[in-house]
Interface confidence: low
């Protein structure tokens, strides 16, 4: 679930989501469209996948809520849950981890981003 | 094209409640947040509050106390209600479109017994 | 909440000229600010938004820039129908907050 996620970003890239990714760019945040505007924006992009590939399992991946251990730095999903709480908890670990893998490039401009002028081809899962 | 429509009573008893509509077309509400915004005569612009694409209403907090948003999705159309007006509601009000890229023309609504 | 500090509130430029308005952040809002210009008795006018990027349809002789806090608008070869009223607006957070509205006036 969201709540799941944003624990989960904040651990992996000690970021405040609400303050740093949701939203950001043309991906991050709810919904999505047109190019991603970077790197980091692309991980949101995958994330959307990701999701979306769920919800074609009849996952219901707002509510959800799965378990999952932080320690030294990792993440460890838990396999007591259903099927779909393991796969949610591996779509937001992925993404957590890209998030942090671009901490680098991150632009504080893209904080916002205005939706509207998110222009391009959005890309395909 | 995209096109925004406000609509509502020119005139309000003071402590009454204000009720407006903004009926937009040429994009869908759950594809875009919309705003709300006052001008009182002369003076400058103040945000009101928003109805997110997914639902979600944020208020600003000096008006949370009598201010409610909602929308009709099926009918393109937010409404903004307040209660309790006061003089000093005398103001035109503007929906607008996330992030002020489209506005409606505007309404004025007058305070007055 | 963010106070959006807009000067001068008027001036008077003549035409040709260049002119600047400004607006002071009371804390970083990371370019989300945005400019609209406002004719009398109509709604207000994107021109500007994440501080520099001109939005669609407006003339290229409008520019905005940002240097920390503070975030400018530059009217360049000023015209006749640039005789209107300003303002500027964050969106970093709620609440948004306009600045109080420049009146520029041609001599």
């Known amino acids: 679930g969201i709540l799941n996620l944003n624990k989960m970003v904040k651990q992996v890239t000690g970021k405040m989501p609400i303050l740093s990714y949701w939203p950001y760019g043309c991906h991050c945040g709810l919904g999505g469209r047109g190019q991603p505007k970077d790197a980091t924006d692309w991980c949101c992009q995958t994330h959307d996948c990701c999701y979306d590939h769920l919800k074609t399992q009849g996952c219901s991946i707002y509510k959800d809520y799965y378990r999952y251990n932080f320690s030294q730095g990792n993440i460890h999903c838990s396999d007591k849950g259903s099927w779909c709480e393991q796969q949610l908890c591996a779509c937001d670990k992925e993404v957590a981890f890209c998030l942090k893998r671009n901490l680098d490039t991150y632009q504080k401009r893209l904080r916002f981003y205005w939706r509207p002028h998110c222009r391009g081809q959005t890309p395909g899962c | 094209q995209v096109q925004l429509k406000e609509s509502g009573p020119g005139l309000v008893q003071p402590s009454q409640t204000l009720s407006l509509t903004c009926t937009v077309s040429?994009?869908?509400?759950?594809?875009?947040?919309m705003q709300w915004v006052r001008q009182p005569p002369g003076k400058g612009l103040e945000w009101m509050g928003a109805i997110w694409a997914n639902g979600n209403i944020q208020y600003n907090s000096i008006l949370k106390s009598r201010l409610s948003i909602s929308r009709d999705t099926s009918k393109s159309q937010v409404f903004l209600k307040m209660n309790s007006l006061q003089t000093e509601d005398t103001a035109i009000y503007f929906c607008?479109?996330?992030?002020?890229?489209?506005w409606g023309q505007g309404v004025m609504v007058t305070v007055s017994s | 909440d963010i106070q959006m500090t807009q000067s001068p509130a008027s001036l008077s430029a003549s035409l040709g000229e260049t002119v600047t308005i400004e607006c002071l952040a009371s804390?970083?809002?990371?370019?989300?600010l945005a400019w609209y210009q406002q004719k009398p008795g109509k709604s207000p006018q994107l021109l500007i938004y994440?501080?520099?990027s001109l939005q669609d349809g407006v003339p290229s002789r409008f520019s905005g820039s940002e240097s920390g806090t503070q975030y400018s608008l530059e009217i360049n070869s000023l015209q006749s129908e640039d005789a209107v009223t300003y303002f500027c607006?964050?969106?970093?957070?709620?609440?948004?907050?306009f600045g109080s509205g420049t009146k520029l006036e041609i001599k």
């Open positions: 804390e970083d809002i990371y370019s989300n």
């Open positions: 040429g994009f869908a509400l759950t594809s875009y947040d």
């Open positions: 607008a479109r996330f992030r002020f890229d489209y």
């Open positions: 994440d501080a520099s």
């Open positions: 607006q964050h969106h970093r957070d709620s609440p948004l907050t």
